[in-house]
């Protein structure tokens, strides 16, 4: 399928022209420009960068570029009253204090406004007490502590290692366990790859490096004070007591040097098994409290951060479509960073910048896309996806009627091993076809396609000869578009070898050491992986905006629906007696999936055969494809999570980063054996099966012949 059929273009203006215009050297230059000073959300520096990007996008040739501002709740440390944690002796004297700031990297000693490590939205407080080590603070870790080890976290300060799950879930779990404070730390087992030096000599985390991050449990709400609606000039704001998702106990992050000082004194229970041991030179005792000689010592937190309503700025650029200007393909990524943002987000923002430049170059030569392309530089992603969510809330009516697709563009790299793609099943074939046309940047795959190197290095667990494509979870700006609005979404980046590198994310994530030099020296000196990611993201946008028939294959949804139905059924079948007792049947769901499969197959046949020269029929078929994702939206949302409305996918209730399939049923079944009222619990399972079956059937019917 060619993409050069859009109006007013010469044959040279096709996908190849767009891709050929993308240059690694430009991405490198843009990354350098975006990373010389911090661009924390809500600061003057980030406002200035917004205006710079607005100006440059205009120069590149976009039709319009506007700033969209909102006044949202952000969180900052107190500049004169720093946050830290102490070990105190029986007299209350501080005998050890954790760091007040990270040791600055070489060349950045004199940079001002480096925000010290903090957990954004932590309440103020100075709790003191005994420590309990809770491993990763996952749901299963607290089950192990409370149910198996009979350790009570109530009134304790818990210390948890970063990794495996979103930090906000850790804090929520700690709160539910009754903890009065949370210390988060980066263990070398998760953030120090063997055989690699720490920064500035390599890409590993030094002992003084600390991961910043928000600890909200927003569940898609956006600004905590204006859930569901934009935080505009006339917004009604909730009181702080009614704000969505704020933690109720003080939280603070530390590095592994400081963690060693706390953990080396731990007494109490030994770790339950080896999975609770990290790589520090400590016993990983669970506690509570310190061992014999140190048993009178306590841990004290000193947290003085403040929550403040602050103005943020999105940059929204428009390249008007020539044929279907009322159909929007969106490419968006955030601009705000915790410090320099060498990887997160500026490796993504630099790629977006080059994609805009390439599209602009084509436009200046007389080309236009078939559909409108919107480009977004989001603000305050690090504070809870606030910029993207507020903009989507403000424009929800337009988006739900006109939104074709959203492609996310945060960090372009989290490693340099192979491609990683998470997307709606509708985009599987698009991604496969595109990557077959792109050259692999990988060593040993010269002259081979990206598809080939990706499939070799990251094979699909289900289909031989195909690459792994993962479910969308959350923790990034696609959330509101996909989970709330039901707009087909996807993301792509270069990643590490998950088999050999078992650390979580990349070691320097959200630390002061995430610099331009980190990328240029250690990850991608030639910027060839950045260029490949630009080709993938840009190529997807090009096809989505320019192909006559939308490049969505509804049959791929049918395949995964069957897989997800099988999976949730097998989970339920772990309780055969209860299923029999409460007459739990999945027949309706399997029937709906079967119907969806048959209808999707027939739709695909019609898609091959219809008269593409008939604009009405073309538009009709494209609308059925566009609105298929929308059909999976339940207007009532998931239980207790009204802004997660997608019935097939939602962020896991136990890890915001991970996607869960049939989340309503999954959550109803989770830990069901511990529910006090089994009849009520299994009743909810049945209700969720009903909702899922209805939704799949209803979605199938949107693909039926219209009359």
């Amino acid at each position: 399928k060619s993409s050069n059929e859009a109006t007013n273009i010469t044959p040279k203006h096709n996908m190849k022209a767009f891709l050929d215009e993308l240059k690694a050297e430009n991405i490198k230059k843009f990354l350098y420009n975006f990373t010389q000073i911090p661009h924390l959300a809500g600061t003057e520096q980030n406002f200035q960068l917004a205006k710079q990007i607005q100006s440059q996008w205009k120069e590149f040739g976009l039709d319009s570029v506007e700033l969209a501002h909102y006044d949202v709740l952000l969180s900052y440390p107190n500049k004169t009253h720093p946050n830290y944690i102490s070990i105190i002796n029986e007299d209350g004297n501080e005998i050890f204090n954790t760091s007040l700031f990270e040791p600055p990297p070489p060349g950045y000693e004199n940079v001002s406004d480096i925000v010290p490590p903090f957990s954004a939205f932590s309440p103020q407080g100075m709790p003191e007490g005994d420590l309990v080590y809770v491993n990763y603070a996952r749901t299963e870790d607290f089950f192990k502590l409370e149910r198996d080890m009979k350790i009570n976290c109530s009134g304790k300060i818990v210390i948890a290692r970063y990794g495996k799950v979103f930090r906000g879930n850790k804090v929520k779990n700690a709160q539910l366990a009754g903890a009065k404070g949370v210390i988060l730390y980066s263990d070398p087992a998760d953030y120090f790859a063997p055989g690699v030096k720490s920064y500035p000599d390599g890409w590993n985390l030094p002992g003084g490096g600390v991961q910043r991050g928000n600890i909200l449990n927003l569940n898609g709400a956006g600004d905590p004070l204006t859930p569901g609606y934009p935080a505009n000039e006339y917004a009604y704001r909730r009181g702080i007591a009614e704000a969505v998702g704020l933690p109720s106990i003080p939280v603070h992050p530390i590095g592994y040097y400081d963690a060693q000082k706390l953990l080396e004194k731990m007494g109490g229970s030994a770790p339950p098994d080896s999975s609770w041991r990290g790589s520090l030179k400590v016993p990983y005792n669970v506690g509570p409290g310190f061992t014999g000689n140190f048993s009178t010592q306590k841990v004290k937190m000193h947290i003085h951060s403040t929550n403040e309503v602050t103005r943020i700025y999105n940059v929204i650029g428009t390249l008007r479509g020539a044929v279907e200007p009322d159909r929007y393909v969106i490419l968006g990524g955030h601009r705000d960073s915790w410090v320099f943002g060498g990887i997160d987000p500026q490796s993504g923002a630099a790629v977006v910048h080059e994609i805009v430049r390439s599209f602009g170059t084509l436009k200046k030569e007389g080309w236009r896309p078939r559909r409108t392309i919107l480009f977004a530089s989001w603000d305050a992603e690090e504070f809870g996806l606030l910029g993207s969510t507020e903009w989507a809330e403000e424009n929800s009516r337009l988006l739900q009627e006109r939104g074709v697709a959203y492609i996310n563009a945060d960090s372009s790299i989290e490693g340099n091993y192979t491609l990683r793609v998470d997307c709606t099943p509708l985009m599987y074939s698009l991604v496969h076809n595109l990557t077959k046309e792109l050259k692999s940047p990988d060593e040993g795959f010269e002259g081979k396609s990206l598809y080939e190197s990706w499939t070799k290095k990251s094979p699909s667990p289900e289909f031989s000869g195909m690459p792994r494509i993962s479910k969308l979870g959350s923790g990034n700006d696609f959330e509101v578009f996909f989970q709330r609005l039901g707009i087909a979404s996807g993301r792509a980046r270069y990643t590490k070898n998950w088999e050999t590198n078992k650390f979580s994310g990349y070691p320097l994530y959200h630390s002061v050491y995430e610099t331009y030099e980190l990328v240029e020296k250690f990850y991608d000196p030639m910027f060839k992986y950045h260029l490949t990611v630009a080709q993938v993201r840009g190529g997807m946008v090009f096809e989505l905006a320019n192909s006559i028939v939308l490049p969505f294959d509804c049959r791929d949804y049918a395949v995964v629906l069957r897989k997800y139905a099988d999976k949730i059924y097998s989970i339920s079948m772990k309780h055969p007696q209860e299923m029999k007792t409460y007459s739990v049947s999945f027949d309706s769901l399997f029937s709906a999936v079967k119907n969806f499969t048959e209808i999707a197959s027939k739709f695909s046949e019609r898609l091959q055969d219809f008269d593409k020269s008939n604009p009405i029929v073309l538009r009709m078929m494209n609308d059925q494809l566009m609105f298929l994702e929308r059909a999976f939206i339940d207007p009532l949302g998931l239980p207790d999570r009204p802004f997660y409305r997608h019935v097939i996918y939602a962020p896991s209730s136990h890890n915001k980063y991970a996607g869960e399939s049939f989340p309503g049923i999954y959550d109803a079944l989770f830990d069901i054996e511990s529910k006090v009222d089994p009849s009520k619990a299994w009743g909810e399972v049945k209700r969720q099966i009903y909702v899922a079956a209805f939704t799949v059937q209803a979605a199938a019917e949107t693909l039926s012949e219209v009359a």
Epitope: F96, P103, P104, P206, G208, D258, E264, P283
Partner: antibody, heavy 120, light 108 residues
């Protein structure tokens, strides 16, 4: 290049005070913990004091606690050791040594030392 | 106060292996560091974090740790390795301590 240069040593009477300085150059002073280590004539190394890069912690050997004070001036890239109530047993070569802040890289750069003699 | 014990001296022929031990109760929870000091000179770091070698230090120097003992091994000793060697570690109160020191003599 990376360099530490101590100064301020000399001969002093017991009970008197002395201030040692250590001028740092060629590296990011604000990223390094700084130590004082001494060596009495013909004896082994004795750690004296440490100040963390962010000044969050200062620790002293029991033998000098209450008498010596470690400090630093980031603007001058200089480390200090204020030594009060000096004793004969404080006679030693005093070295300053850096270690990367909150890390496990050890004291990787040392000065050449300055000699303190406490004698009546 | 906390002590790190080393043998006062070790003698070794050129090309042979020298092993210097350092014992202390806190070593299972604390990293050890090794320094070489030649007469009239400042100490030089030769091993950090129990077993890591700084750049510029010959590969014949290695470190290991087991329980309350750490060991510095010099494989294929050379004449220029004759020096005093000190281990160093920390205790749980945040203070540092040096070992008693070991004089390595290269025979012949």
């Amino acid at each position: 290049q990376v360099q530490l240069v101590e100064s301020g040593g000399g001969v002093v009477q017991p009970g008197r005070s002395l201030r040692l300085s250590c001028a740092a150059s060629g590296f990011t002073f604000s990223s390094y913990n700084m130590n004082w280590v001494r060596q009495a004539p013909g004896k082994g190394l004795e750690w004296v004091a440490i100040i963390y890069y962010d000044e969050s912690n200062k620790y002293y050997a029991d033998s000098v606690k209450g008498r010596f004070t470690i400090s630093r001036d980031i603007s001058k890239n200089t480390l200090y050791l204020q030594m009060n109530s000096l004793r004969a047993e404080d006679t030693a070569v005093y070295y300053c040594a850096r270690e990367r802040g909150r890390d496990y890289y050890g004291m990787d750069v040392w000065g050449q030392g300055t000699t303190v003699t406490v004698s009546s | 106060s906390y002590e790190l014990m080393q043998p006062p001296s070790v003698s070794v022929s050129p090309g042979q292996t020298a092993r210097i031990t350092c014992s202390g109760d806190a070593l299972p929870k604390q990293y050890a560091y090794w320094y070489q000091q030649k007469p009239g000179q400042a100490p030089v770091l030769v091993i950090y974090k129990d077993s890591e070698r700084p750049s510029g230090i010959p590969v014949r120097f290695s470190g290991s740790s087991s329980g309350t003992t750490v060991t510095l091994t010099i494989t294929g000793v050379q004449a220029e390795d004759e020096a005093d060697y000190y281990c160093q570690s920390a205790d749980s109160s945040g203070t540092y301590v040096f070992g008693t020191g070991t004089k390595v003599t290269v025979l012949g």
